[in-house]
């Protein structure tokens, strides 16, 4: 016996919709092997009507697929618009027809039911409202108006204009009869059910003269949808469930092997931790329409979604829903990167974000993943230069390297900054991606001391120590604002071998300012970069006074060695909707720095890379 | 979930036929996946048919052991659901139990975990 298992027999109606659903044992062959749909001929051969391969018969064209289900065992053969001609037998199968694994399958399309005249047709999903519209005459306008149920010869009613409603429609169902001059009453069902289908009969009045109108409801399961998304990437549900749900809870479940759907997130704020910084709800809109991104998506992803509405923000049976079948593509053109960058208290972070390399002009963002209720995600930077308030002098987006990638910066880290920060751009809205931040125990590696008050029109040296790991790269101060961190001329004093060999005498690089103007005052980085790579960087404020007062605090750097190297990278992945920047409810507006001023002059400033002995200190 | 009370089982000769009823409380049965499982003693409980309505389809299954003198049918109207029987053999003896599985997903309906409504069972004696 073949171990491929599906429907025995199908039947349906002209004009409906099968989706035909076919098991098979999930070997590593078989997952990989082609699919197919075939129909029985009189000769025993079996013709191929679709396959996994791509191949659909002229006959299925424009109606028909087959979806392979890899990781359940299954695929699926939908088949649109039927007609009579499709009665017949058939076999889903793997590998060849003529001697594969199937399954036999017999399908049966039958007329449907006679319709009688005049038959408004109903088509609805399940879960969702219908208007059924019942026309009636002057003179019945004062009589009783019902909606009846045809259910073999019989009648039932539904419900009347005299208050009944029959118990199976009990808080579902309302009749609603216009002002005068108006000739028409309506019945609205909500929620529907697959067993409200079926031929319905309004009536005005009785007697001879009574006016009638028939109505077939036919109410459907929600086909998913199909959505294919890059691993790394991230995808939007979007999910509009229409006016008569706006004000209730609303869901994203996932379908699980026992066929129940597990929360993914909720409106009453239920989350499932496996989503933890990688997921928003997006508030909805007036008409209750809402959407859920997720990013970073992994292959454990891949599965049946559903979205609906329902008071206790779970799935319940009558209610509207939505449905998606989601797949993770494994070849991804987002760029592998670590989802978790490490750093240590006081020291520093470099997050590289990729971006579709196509739209190098887009905004670049970076945002702070924030999971209370329903998920948001503030911006923190933006590549306009704007900078939220508590992050001046520590935050920078910087375009390099370019390509596909560009560099969030953020140093003097404290506990606090641990979390989930996402990139983001307002172009391909894919590329969204996630990276986690950690703070591990340790020294930063950069020493720079802990403040400087320079005298105006004197001249100031901040040194900056870096560890022997740092000598092959390069070494940088930068003058911050909110526009970015503006590198200063670099003079190299030291000769090049004593980085090399990288001399006790020689692991410092000092920032000279002279003459010190207003313009001066504010933050600088010391930093550390290879090529277009950024790595560690230290922040030290400069403040300036009138009067001659003390230097600078020196910062010991022992230990300097001694703190891990630091991870540069982030979590590829994938999208939020394009709106979702300019969504104030998805990135709350924040205040922002103003610009710093001017940058320091070049002329006065510069970097010297040279012995720490000059500088009246020493490294261990 | 729904009720289910089954009905319809009892001895007969093999070669003979027997019609098991499957009566569903709950507004909401024919969104519901029926099937049949049936246990002999001393053994694993085996699927034996199933019937899934999505609004505009039908799609009926049964197991290889049963193909060709086992049909299910279910009719919505009376939310009750009909596994007819015929050319019985001894080694269909077992008590026939009704599953439901719940919407608006349906899974491998030969799982007896994707039900979540069982009924107490039938007891069927095929005599040689």
């Known amino acids: 016996k073949s171990p491929v298992f599906g429907p025995q027999e199908v039947s349906s109606v002209e004009g409906n919709s099968v989706s035909i659903k076919c098991y098979y044992p999930p070997t590593s062959v078989n997952r990989h092997t082609r699919k197919y749909w075939c129909r029985k001929g009189a000769s025993g051969r079996c013709i191929t009507l679709v396959s996994s391969e791509g191949y659909v018969s002229s006959n299925y064209a424009g109606r028909a697929n087959l979806t392979n289900f890899p990781e359940n065992g299954t695929f699926v053969v939908n088949i649109a618009q039927l007609s009579r001609d499709d009665s017949g037998h058939y076999k889903c199968g793997l590998g060849i027809n003529s001697r594969g694994l199937s399954f036999d399958v017999s399908l049966e399309v039958s007329q449907g039911p006679e319709l009688p005249n005049g038959t408004e047709v109903y088509t609805v999903d399940v879960g969702r409202t219908v208007t059924i519209k019942c026309p009636f005459k002057t003179e019945n306008a004062p009589k009783t108006k019902a909606l009846y149920k045809k259910i073999g010869q019989t009648s039932v009613l539904v419900i009347d204009s005299r208050n009944y409603v029959n118990p199976n429609y009990k808080d579902r169902i309302r009749l609603r009869i216009p002002g005068t001059g108006q000739l028409i009453f309506t019945v609205v069902i909500d929620r529907l059910r697959l067993s409200d289908h079926g031929l319905y009969l309004c009536q005005a009045g009785d007697g001879s003269n009574r006016d009638e109108k028939n109505a077939d409801l036919q109410v459907l399961e929600p086909e998913p949808e199909l959505v294919y998304e890059d691993l790394r990437g991230s995808v939007t549900f979007h999910c509009a469930l229409g006016l008569e749900v706006a004000n209730v809870a609303k869901f994203l479940c996932r379908v699980n092997s026992r066929e129940t759907c597990d929360v993914v997130i909720n409106t009453l704020g239920k989350r499932d931790s496996a989503f933890e910084g990688r997921i928003l709800l997006n508030p909805q809109d007036k008409d209750g329409s809402f959407s859920v991104v997720i990013t970073g998506l992994r292959k454990e992803d891949e599965g049946r979604y559903l979205c609906g509405a329902h008071s206790d923000g779970q799935l319940q049976e009558g209610w509207p829903i939505q449905a998606w079948q989601l797949f993770v593509n494994e070849e991804s053109t987002i760029p592998r990167s670590p989802t978790v960058v490490k750093g240590v208290a006081g020291g520093s972070v470099a997050v590289l974000c990729p971006y579709n390399p196509k739209e190098s002009q887009s905004l670049k963002y970076w945002c702070l993943w924030e999971g209370a209720q329903n998920g948001r995600c503030p911006l923190l930077v933006e590549s306009q230069g704007l900078v939220q308030e508590q992050y001046e002098g520590r935050l920078s987006l910087l375009q390099e390297p370019g390509n596909g990638t560009f560099t969030v910066i953020l140093n003097q880290l404290t506990t606090q900054d641990a979390g989930f920060y996402w990139c983001l751009t307002n172009g391909d809205t894919r590329w969204r991606t996630t990276v986690e931040i950690k703070i591990i125990e340790g020294e930063p590696n950069l020493k720079v001391p802990g403040n400087v008050t320079a005298v105006l029109g004197e001249t100031l040296n901040i040194p900056c120590h870096f560890p022997c790991k740092f000598s092959s790269y390069e070494k940088y101060w930068c003058k911050w604002s909110n526009t970015g961190c503006q590198t200063l001329p670099s003079q190299d004093e030291g000769p090049s071998e004593a980085f090399v060999n990288c001399d006790e005498n020689s692991r410092l690089v000092s920032l000279t300012l002279n003459p010190v103007t207003r313009a001066d005052e504010g933050w600088y980085w010391c930093g550390v970069k290879q090529g277009h790579f950024y790595g560690e960087t230290a922040a030290v404020y400069v403040a300036v006074e009138e009067k001659k007062v003390a230097g600078s605090r020196y910062v010991s750097p022992a230990k300097a060695d001694a703190a891990p190297d630091e991870k540069v990278l982030d979590s590829g992945v994938r999208e939020i909707e394009n709106k979702a920047i300019q969504d104030p409810r998805l990135f709350a507006e924040e205040k922002v720095v103003a610009d710093t001023g001017d940058q320091a002059g070049g002329s006065r400033a510069s970097v010297d890379s040279s012995s720490s002995e000059e500088q009246g200190g020493s490294s261990k | 979930q729904v009720q289910l009370v089954e009905s319809g089982g009892g001895l007969v000769q093999a070669g003979g036929s027997l019609r098991l009823s499957c009566a569903a409380s709950?507004?909401?049965?024919?969104?519901?996946?029926m099937g049949w499982f049936r246990q002999a003693p001393g053994k694993e409980r085996e699927f034996v048919a199933a019937i899934h309505w999505n609004g505009a389809s039908t799609y009926r299954y049964s197991a290889d052991s049963v193909k060709g003198r086992f049909t299910i049918s279910r009719d919505n109207a009376k939310n009750t659901v009909y596994l007819q029987m015929n050319s019985l053999k001894p080694e269909d003896t077992a008590a026939y139990y009704c599953?439901?599985?719940?919407?608006?997903?349906?899974?491998?309906?030969?799982?007896?975990?994707?039900?979540?409504?069982w009924g107490q069972g039938t007891l069927v004696t095929v005599s040689s």
């Open positions: 599953a439901a599985s719940p919407p608006p997903t349906v899974g491998d309906v030969r799982d007896p975990a994707n039900y979540d409504s």
């Open positions: 709950g507004r909401t049965f024919s969104s519901y996946a």
